[in-house]
């Protein structure tokens, strides 16, 4: 069951794993629901009655049975992971804990304007796991207004103590908010020299990059492969650091890949969760289970829907058929299986089973990063949860209709285009609707998200001249579904990827005089380069702000009704919004592409409106 | 952990100079300020100067002509020289990490005597 | 220059006693003094920071108290091995400064 509730003065006696800090009740619940075997936890809060070493120890705690027995305590405050529970994990901590000392290891010390400035200075150092900031009225005045930036072994704090006129907090790179270098490529037969920091088993290297990834201290890494000569070593996944941040020295192997943590890549961290079954392979770890099933997406359900199952192998069993020879039955054994760490203790090949992981840390995920199967005028209807971050904005003055699309990109963000707001007076006469596929399902009763504010770009004039892009802040905040989640923006790091499966979609018209669509249409379209748009557009200027996509046989294109929808394309399984629906001249006609706001431009615009002020 | 060690000459000459290592382990220089305290025998404590991990410094007035403090980040190690040493230079000389202008770890000391 | 000044250069105590010693600044240092504690052949131990915060692994038995320009730190009941000097020191500006010390003997 999935218990969100906090108990407080109470204490889960027994059971404990591990003890650290953290400098409040929430964050404990956080660090225990990405522990490997943390069930349940008991914060010590401040408390007059409690021995103030002991306050902010987080204890982490598991029990065989899922509970353990509560106690009375004044100051303690338990709770259960949200491992149990359906609902997105986010890592992702930006609270500022005023008169709070996070003890770490200091490693840098500058001064600073402000504690979101120390903060962003943290989130943009490769090392930097929390801060601490002396404020302006701090009694020291050489250490007035000083950030120091701390790292420590696990990534949380050693001690957290009581501090007048200090401010402390964490990293937002797991808020997808670092400015450092994203290097998503894989290097093949590389292995690196740099000192390991931690080593684990893993079938494959892309299990080597995501452990490494969500590692507080790993930078980069190097898996060594089931065909690498030295037997005790396959399978190994290295992880690895170094005081620049980057690896030292490269050196060629067959049997090696080496890689990058993802941890600094805006919206695109993978998540621990591998979803592949890995055949002809049997992990070892300490036996939790074993239960009959058909087949292995069976084995791997029951372990995902087993708590404490961390992976699992499925061996087939080999029965005669009725024509008498061997075969592999569908009906198996199901080991489930768990480890100190995660990861399997051993990796075996060539006994027949078949492994995996659970798939419960799948949630965990950075929500715009869901593998999503994919694949408007000349375009194709769209199936239901296709495109899970396009809404439709209904204005509902003087009557209610369709206005424009829009992208959500965050719980409380929809971003979409400037120019859908001439008419606009009030955000009040603005709906969006999301996890709509036809515009018929909306009726009276239909649940919709008012909009608290509309941002538009204050260089928008027009959308031929370009800033053709507006923020929606909605007035509550919205729960991820299949059907409505968002996009990943693209990052600034990412401007070389050349993206080949690019979509737009919308409910617009499918010919220039037409009507709204009914069902969200979407059309495949290549992008074209600046150059050949500017060709096609004489009378005006293509900006680096701009994008253009379409076929020059027209055919397939945004219209009237699309705009402010996504340009959503694919790079490595992870869709990226590239543009926004803007402008054209007609729709789809021969040499005339649509031109669409480029994002990737206005991605620190984006980024400084939706902070919390 | 957090260790501090000072190595000094031991003895020297008035109107020489003095140079003091202070090397660290445990922390690194770039995160945290390094102090100078000396303590003549028999007597108190005094605050000579220190090092910030920026590499700022300041120094105690009386002494501001004749000190300075340096560090080599790379190899944890801060230096402070003195010169026109006097015989009432003579004392223990500590290095210390600061924690927020106090000090929370202190080396053993190394002793130095000033005389002919 | 900031000067402290601790008016007792030795106090007299005996195991169980309350024993409170003071420093004076010449200026006013906020709450940034601290008091160190100094035992024959040994280096400085930090006590107390920011005039009241206990550093790690310090005995709740030791206590500070104060603000501006008058500081005292106090031990509530006096052990054996507390019989050493204790010295104030501001660290509102630099130069940073120390008081002369106090030294705790047995009565």
């Known amino acids: 069951d999935c218990v969100t509730k906090l108990f407080k003065d109470t204490l889960f006696q027994g059971g404990d794993i591990s003890t650290v800090f953290t400098p409040s009740a929430e964050h404990c619940q956080v660090v225990c629901t990405h522990h490997p075997r943390c069930l349940l936890f008991t914060f010590m809060a401040e408390s007059p009655t409690e021995d103030p070493t002991k306050w902010f120890t987080c204890v982490l705690k598991d029990s065989i049975t899922e509970t353990l027995p509560k106690v009375n305590m004044s100051g303690a405050i338990s709770g259960y992971s949200f491992k149990q529970c359906p609902h997105q994990i986010n890592a992702c901590n930006n609270h500022l804990y005023v008169d709070l000392d996070m003890k770490g290891m200091n490693y840098k010390d500058s001064v600073a304007k402000s504690a979101h400035e120390c903060q962003e200075r943290c989130t943009n150092d490769i090392h930097c796991h929390f801060f601490t900031y002396a404020t302006w009225s701090f009694p020291s005045e050489q250490h007035r207004n000083v950030c120091l930036l701390k790292y420590t072994q696990m990534g949380t704090p050693t001690r957290i103590m009581k501090i007048n006129e200090v401010v402390s907090g964490f990293s937002l790179k797991s808020c997808a908010l670092s400015n450092l270098a994203c290097i998503r490529d894989i290097f093949p037969r590389t292995g690196f020299a740099d000192s390991n920091i931690d080593s684990v088993l893993v079938p494959d290297v892309f299990v080597c990059q995501s452990i490494c990834t969500h590692h507080p201290n790993c930078l980069f890494f190097t898996f060594l492969s089931k065909d690498w000569p030295k037997e005790s070593e396959r399978n190994l996944c290295l992880l690895k650091s170094s005081l620049s941040g980057l690896p030292s020295t490269r050196y060629g192997k067959d049997n090696a890949f080496s890689g990058f943590s993802l941890q600094n890549c805006r919206h695109s961290v993978p998540v621990l969760c591998h979803s592949s079954f890995y055949p002809d392979t049997d992990f070892l770890g300490e036996e939790l289970d074993i239960v009959d099933v058909e087949g292995r997406e069976a084995c791997q359900k029951v372990c995902t829907d087993t708590l404490r199952c961390q992976f699992f192998t499925y061996s087939p069993s080999q029965q005669p058929s009725n024509k008498g020879n061997l075969f592999p039955s569908c009906r198996g054994k199901c080991y489930l299986k768990l480890s100190l760490n995660g990861s399997p203790t051993k990796i075996l090949h060539g006994r027949g089973g078949i492994s995996g992981y659970t798939l419960r840390l799948c949630k965990m995920d950075n929500v715009c990063t869901n593998r999503i199967n994919a694949r408007i005028v000349g375009g194709t209807a769209s199936v239901y949860s296709e495109w899970p971050w396009q809404i439709t904005l209904h204005t509902t003055s003087p009557t209610q209709r369709h206005l424009c699309g829009g992208s959500i990109i965050g719980n409380q963000w929809i971003l979409t285009a400037a120019h859908c707001f001439i008419e606009v007076d009030s955000p009040k006469i603005l709906r969006v609707y999301s996890g709509i596929l036809n515009q018929s399902e909306i009726k009276e009763d239909t649940t919709f998200f008012g909009v608290q504010e509309i941002i538009i770009h204050d260089q928008y004039k027009m959308a031929e001249s370009g800033y053709d892009i507006a923020l929606l802040k909605l007035e509550t905040t919205m729960n991820y579904t299949d059907f409505q989640r968002p996009i990943c923006l693209p990052s600034k790091s990412d401007r070389n990827i050349t993206y080949t499966e690019c979509w737009v979609t919308g409910w617009g018209y499918r010919k220039l005089r037409d009507k709204i669509q009914n069902t969200l249409q979407k059309a495949k379209v290549p992008l074209i380069t600046n150059d050949e748009c500017q060709t096609r557009y004489t009378g005006h200027k293509i900006t680096n702000k701009m994008v253009c996509a379409g076929y020059k046989e027209g055919g397939r294109d945004a219209c009237k009704g699309d705009s402010g929808g996504p340009l959503s394309c694919k790079h490595k399984e992870v869709w990226y919004l590239v543009g926004i629906t803007s402008w054209g001249e007609g729709c789809a006609q021969s040499g005339r592409p649509g031109v669409y706001t480029n994002v990737i431009e206005y991605v620190d615009w984006i980024l400084e409106k939706t902070q919390p002020a | 952990q957090v260790q501090l060690e000072e190595s000094g000459p031991g003895l020297v000459a008035p109107s020489q100079s003095l140079s003091i290592t202070c090397t660290v382990s445990?922390?690194?220089?770039?995160?945290?300020?390094i102090y100078w305290v000396r303590q003549p025998p028999g007597k108190g404590l005094e605050w000579l100067g220190m090092?910030?991990?920026?590499?700022?410094?300041d120094y105690n007035s009386a002494l501001k002509s004749r000190l300075s403090i340096s560090k080599d980040n790379s190899k944890s190690q801060v230096f402070l020289k003195m010169n026109s040493l006097q015989t009432d230079d003579t004392a223990r000389y500590y290095c210390a990490r600061d924690y927020y202008g106090s000090k929370d770890y202190w080396g053993q000391g190394t002793t130095l005597t000033v005389s002919s | 220059d900031i000067v402290m000044t601790q008016s007792h250069k030795f106090m007299s105590t005996s195991v169980g006693d309350r024993v409170s010693i003071t420093c004076k600044a010449s200026?006013?240092?906020?709450?940034?003094v601290a008091w160190y504690q100094q035992k024959p052949g040994q280096s400085p131990k930090l006590l107390i920071y920011?005039?009241?915060y206990r550093n790690t692994g310090v005995p709740d038995r030791f206590t500070g108290s104060g603000s501006g320009t008058d500081f005292t730190f106090t031990i509530s009941s006096v052990q054996a091995e507390d019989l050493a000097v204790y010295y104030c020191?501001?660290?509102?500006?630099?130069?940073?400064?120390f008081g002369g010390g106090t030294k705790l003997e047995r009565l």
């Open positions: 090092i910030w991990g920026d590499g700022r410094t």
């Open positions: 020191q501001q660290h509102y500006k630099t130069p940073y400064s």
């Open positions: 445990g922390f690194s220089l770039t995160g945290y300020g």
């Open positions: 920011l005039t009241s």
């Open positions: 200026q006013d240092v906020s709450t940034a």
